[in-house]
């Protein structure tokens, strides 16, 4: 079956700068700023656009080894990034895949809001438990905070 879920996280970084760093340059930046979570991101095929496959290797101490993602759409104008987790122990034995739409919007008082809409595709009649969703949200938040800290410390970058 399918389970729809969404979450949002505020950031002090403006939308354009956050998208440029966290999304467009995330493959390089995230392993650099959060090596305790992700050790490497490798583009297996494609140039970063739709159809690109990324192999993400987690750091030691993280309960997952790797994840394989497929890029479905990159919308630079609207700060939107669509991708699907298609493989990896992160899916466990109950999930077939998970599609995410990450959208960064300007926040009214400055900064931005990172919105993630997810579609969990479970195998057969399996239910998607709340822990799985909470875990995904916490992981994304941890990476976002690491990027945020880096950007606050390196004000000349990604402008």
């Amino acid at each position: 079956g399918v389970f729809n879920y969404e979450a949002e996280t505020p950031s002090v970084i403006p939308a354009a700068r956050l998208f440029k760093s966290y999304v467009l340059d995330g493959d390089k930046l995230i392993p650099k700023v959060a090596p305790q979570v992700i050790s490497s991101v490798e583009n297996v095929g494609g140039n970063g656009g739709p159809g690109t496959i990324k192999n993400i290797t987690f750091a030691e101490g993280i309960p997952f080894k790797f994840v394989k993602e497929r890029v479905d759409e990159v919308d630079n104008a609207n700060f939107k990034y669509n991708y699907t987790v298609i493989e990896g122990d992160v899916l466990g034995d109950k999930l077939e895949k998970v599609s995410h739409e990450l959208k960064i919007v300007a926040a009214p008082g400055g900064g931005s809001i990172v919105k993630i809409s997810s579609k969990f595709h479970a195998k057969g009649y399996h239910e998607v438990n709340a822990e799985k969703m909470k875990g995904a949200k916490e992981m994304a938040e941890k990476l976002l905070r690491a990027v945020e800290s880096y950007l606050l410390a390196h004000t000349a970058e990604y402008n």
Epitope: G1, V2, Y5, D72, S117, H121, E127
Partner: antibody, heavy 122, light 108 residues
């Protein structure tokens, strides 16, 4: 403007097959999931099936699983519902409906066709 | 599956009156993933509300949606003659996507 036009309904005997078509226009078809929803005479709405924007994912309601197959042709902006082993309880108006959210979809329906009536009777 | 129970089954009201329609879910609807549709005789349903409270394009502001826990409400502030119809709620949090059995708003 968004338009969905169903066709292919009619009277069919139990156990036989039928193929419904849904012709879409007025939106970027290849970016939206499409659903089939049916309504038995005098009854409420029942979700039947969905096909993802790229045709990779297909899901069905329990009452039609294993008998109905949904497919799409993005080049023709068409969606089809192949109905096999039809039963009298499949008698209904069948609507195709556009998902309200692009790409992965959110599974609510912002535009509906006018419906096509399928009558399963001996 | 998530079961949606609508009440009342029939709501007899006069034009100008306020209509309050209820939809109760058998389990939690995360992210307010609930929609409302209007259906008139021999017509297709029409989306009114999604996300429990967001009005769809072109829907007049006399239609509003709200939620409290697993209880969802569609309110029509002042009934117009064209509002007499059947109303359905639908959840889209987990498949199979399910509808309530409908509430008929009829002229008293």
């Amino acid at each position: 403007q968004v338009q969905l036009v169903e066709s292919g309904g009619g009277v069919v005997q139990p156990g036989r097959s039928l193929r419904l078509s849904c012709a879409a226009s007025g939106f970027t078809f290849s970016r939206y999931a499409i659903h089939w929803v049916r309504q038995a005479p005098g009854k409420g709405l029942e979700w039947v099936a969905v096909i993802s924007y790229d045709g990779d994912d297909k899901y069905y309601g329990d009452s039609v699983k294993g008998r109905f197959t949904i497919s799409r042709d993005n080049s023709k902006t068409m969606v089809y519902l192949h109905m096999n082993s039809l039963r009298t309880e499949d008698t209904a108006v069948y609507y195709c409906a556009k998902d309200g959210y692009s790409l992965y979809g959110k599974d609510y329906f912002d535009y509906w066709g006018q419906g096509t009536l399928v009558t399963v009777s001996s | 599956e998530i079961v949606l129970t609508q009440s009342p089954g029939t709501l007899p009201l006069s034009p100008g009156e306020r209509a309050t329609l209820s939809c109760r879910a058998s389990q939690s609807i995360t992210n307010s993933y609930l929609a409302w549709y209007q259906q008139k005789p021999d017509q297709a349903p029409r989306l009114l509300i999604y996300g429990a409270s967001s009005r769809a394009t072109g829907i007049p502001d006399r239609f509003s949606g709200s939620e409290s826990g697993t209880d969802f409400t569609l309110t029509i502030s002042r009934l117009e003659p064209e509002d007499f119809a059947v109303y359905y709620c639908q959840q889209y949090v987990r498949s199979p996507w399910t509808f309530g059995q409908g509430t008929k708003v009829e002229i008293k």
